[in-house]
Interface confidence: low
């Protein structure tokens, strides 16, 4: 067993003093642990010497010497106090991590043994400890919180009474980690896998546990696979990783893969599906109808679902006309990935303008080729109405043109008095035109219809109104004759009231 000179077990010195610690053994000896740069270390025959010419409070700690060749593994220790009147504490670690129910050592070392009677442990800023905090103090080691609880994970300070006042150490953060009382934690990557026959694939099953006593295996359908296991320890947990690497996949590799881990507390498993396909695929679909009708000024989101393997090499939204050569703004196109092989692409069309009706196509490309999905967008418009007086085949005729989408229907009203719009109470006659003549009906455009009202004589104290309506709204135009009795009248002899 090695011997330390001076004999100790404790040595008290003042700051600035020279300290020499000599360890002597039968064979070679060495000092344990990292020696701070304040010390000079040298060998003197069978002994090892630690020396400092300027002791500081930071030299306060236990110094241990061992004899590696000693079969009994004996060691000797001396505890050095450097009693600094301004620095009662030497804190060896600012952060301590333990599991619940372990003892937590907060390594604040007292620099002067005389102060031991007046020490206490407090939370940061002098807060008292949480109730039921069971702790003890060792001047050599610091404060020990026994069977630490998760809630005791706090910032602590060591307090010493010096000359009637309490002097605090710098703070020590205690982290108490919860022990997970269950089976090991598992990950199986990827969550889903698709490969073309002949490609390479990799499936990784990993499990972690608080202690090393646990098992993990990877299973294909019902077969347990024999795969070498890689073990590791980090983040205070034991890790076991199984990696299945397939150089060239075939159809027999497809199926369900399960990662299973167990410990004394039970079993945990997670699964994924591996699909092997003959060739690349690219499928486009939409839950929406490909023929869309929206009222002008409103907004629309066009959504396309894409299932593809391998991944997309390109995609875009294109406006195919017929109104202009404008293209959708990229900022209005959004892509979200549901999972590795399924994506959703959305084109937002806010406040639709007349020139934005038409065909919108989503194109996507992967090694399997190009695919497109085209939406037809027709805008709905409320009817716009105009009435003119004209002569057709020598008969005076009111001609009403109504334009909108869907196709408007037309009703004529005759009512008493001069008015902008016929009131129900004033109506004298109503004519419904069951088949107004369609003047124009182009794709993605308004439908224009025309209705004629032949009137031999227009009463001067009456109003003739053409009304048109469709599912979006209605429009009307009131016509008021200026003079009475005329069989035909040129337009300038009449007042037009829109």
């Amino acid at each position: 067993i090695p011997v330390i000179e001076p004999s100790g077990p404790e040595l008290v010195v003042k700051p600035g003093e020279t300290v020499t610690l000599r360890c002597v053994g039968n064979g070679s000896v060495e000092w344990d642990g990292p020696i701070s740069p304040h010390w000079t270390l040298y060998s003197d025959g069978p002994s090892s010497v630690l020396t400092t010419n300027n002791a500081t409070f930071q030299n306060t700690r236990t110094y241990r010497c061992t004899e590696p060749g000693d079969p009994l593994g004996g060691s000797a220790a001396i505890h050095l106090y450097v009693k600094d009147p301004a620095r009662p504490w030497n804190v060896l670690a600012k952060e301590v991590v333990v599991f619940e129910d372990q003892d937590a050592l907060l390594p604040c070392l007292l620099t002067d043994p005389v102060l031991e009677a007046g020490v206490s442990l407090v939370r940061l800023r002098g807060r008292p400890l949480l109730r039921h905090t069971n702790y003890s103090f060792s001047p050599w080691h610091g404060f020990i919180i026994h069977r630490a609880k998760f809630i005791q994970g706090q910032d602590y300070q060591c307090s010493a009474l010096m000359g009637g006042r309490k002097v605090m150490s710098i703070s020590i953060r205690l982290k108490v980690q919860k022990v997970i009382p269950g089976p090991p934690a598992l990950t199986l990557v990827p969550a889903e896998l698709v490969r073309i026959r002949g490609e390479a694939a990799q499936i990784v099953c990993s499990a972690s546990n608080i202690d090393v006593d646990f098992d993990v295996f990877l299973q294909h359908n019902t077969t347990k696979l024999a795969i070498p296991q890689r073990s590791d320890f980090h983040d205070n947990r034991y890790q076991k990783v199984l990696t299945l690497s397939l150089g060239q996949v075939d159809f027999q590799h497809a199926g369900n893969y399960s990662c299973v881990a167990s410990n004394v507390q039970g079993k945990h498993s997670t699964s994924m599906f591996f699909q092997v396909v003959e060739s690349a695929y690219l499928d486009l679909s939409s839950e929406q109808n490909l023929i869309q009708e929206v009222t002008v000024g409103e907004g629309l989101n066009l959504k396309v679902m894409v299932e593809a393997y391998p991944g997309l090499q390109g995609f875009n939204w294109t406006y195919l006309g017929p109104f202009s050569d404008h293209q959708p703004e990229p900022k209005l196109a959004n892509a979200t990935t549901k999972d590795t092989y399924r994506h959703t692409f959305t084109l937002s069309l806010p406040r639709l303008k007349p020139s934005e009706a038409g065909r919108y196509s989503f194109l996507a490309r992967n090694p399997g080729g190009w695919r497109a999905l085209t939406f037809e967008l027709t805008l709905r418009y409320p009817p716009e109405v105009s009435v003119i007086w004209t002569s057709i085949n020598g008969s005076g005729t009111l001609l009403c043109a109504a334009s909108g989408y869907p196709q408007p229907n037309v009703t004529w009203l005759q009512c008493a008095g001069h008015t902008d719009r016929c009131d129900e109470a004033q109506v004298l006659q109503v004519w419904v035109d069951p088949h107004p003549e369609v003047l124009s009906q182009e794709p993605f455009q308004k439908v224009t219809v025309q209705s004629l009202l032949t009137a031999e004589t227009l009463e001067h104290n009456q109003t003739y109104e053409c009304r048109a309506h469709n599912s979006v709204g209605s429009g009307s135009w009131a016509f008021i004759p200026i003079s009475a009795g005329a069989r035909t009248h040129p337009p300038d002899e009449f007042l037009f009231t829109p």
Epitope: G126, R127, P128, R131, K166, M168
Partner: antibody, heavy 126, light 107 residues
Framework: QVTLKESGPGILQPSQTLSLTCTFS??????????VGWIRQPSGKGLEWLAN???????YYNPSLKNRLTISKDTSNNQAFLKLTNVHTSDSATYYC??????????????????WGPGTMVTVSS | DIQMTQSPASLSASLGETVSIECLAS??????LAWYQKKPGKSPHLLIY???SLQDGVPSRFSGSGSGTQYSLKINSLESEDAATYFC?????????FGGGTKLELK
């Protein structure tokens, strides 16, 4: 004798910055363990803690206002300051500063707001 | 945030009576609670800290008790100068939070 007194603009408009000063005597913010906090009380409502500053310049803020609040100190002039940016009418209140003084307790010093200023009324109005 | 629910919001009592005011925390605050008295036009005055410790200079008729989430302030033998609003403050966790206050009137 410990005294604290708040001063501020009285009235200010929405979106302006409120600057408050707490001038104190009878203690020093350089003393180990000492702190100053700010609290406010809208008329007819309860008290709301805003921020603390400690002797070592450690600062704590109410998360509901954190990105609008700044607390600071000038130890040589025995002053603490609070800035509240982009004020709303709902920031109208009486604002108090208070000392967080060391209280002797059998196991350790323990701290609360032990002395308060008289408060300063702040009105935010357009 | 820890919510502090104080009750009652107001109470009326006669000289010489004993009254109790409660503060309920939304989670355990480990005795980190203070009680204050506030009179109109005056600043708050610390009565009790650490749930039950009496601040220097505060009359002994004031006392605090409780643990965990439930705390109370008791005033024995009410005197006319005790008419005020009383409130609690938790500083167990940031943000520090106050109770809503209890207005004590004397009949």
């Amino acid at each position: 004798q410990v005294t604290l007194k708040e001063s501020g603009p009285g009235i200010l408009q929405p979106s302006q910055t409120l600057s408050l000063t707490c001038t104190f005597s009878g203690f020093s913010l350089t003393t180990y363990g000492m702190g100053v906090g700010w609290i406010r009380q809208p008329s007819g409502k309860g008290l709301e803690w805003l921020a603390n500053i400690w002797w070592d310049d450690d600062k704590y803020y109410n998360p509901s206002l954190k990105n609008r609040l700044t607390i600071s100190k000038d130890t040589s002039n025995n002053q603490a300051f609070l800035k509240l940016t982009n004020v709303h009418t709902s920031d109208s209140a009486t604002y108090y500063c208070a000392r967080i003084g060391p209280i002797k307790y059998p196991t350790a010093p323990y701290r609360y707001f032990d002395f308060w200023g008289p408060g300063t009324m702040v009105t935010v109005s357009s | 945030d820890i919510q502090m629910t104080q009750s009652p919001a107001s109470l009326s009592a006669s000289l010489g009576e004993t009254v109790s005011i409660e503060c309920l925390a939304s989670e355990d605050i480990y005795d980190n609670l203070a009680w204050y008295q506030k009179k109109p036009g005056k600043s708050p005055h610390l009565l009790i800290y650490y749930a039950s410790s009496l601040q220097d200079g505060v009359p002994s008729r004031f006392s605090g008790s409780g643990s965990g989430t439930q705390y109370s302030l008791k005033i024995n033998s009410l005197e006319s100068e005790d008419a005020a609003t009383y409130f609690c403050l938790q500083d167990s966790e940031y943000p520090w939070t106050f109770g809503g206050g209890t207005k004590l009137e004397l009949k």
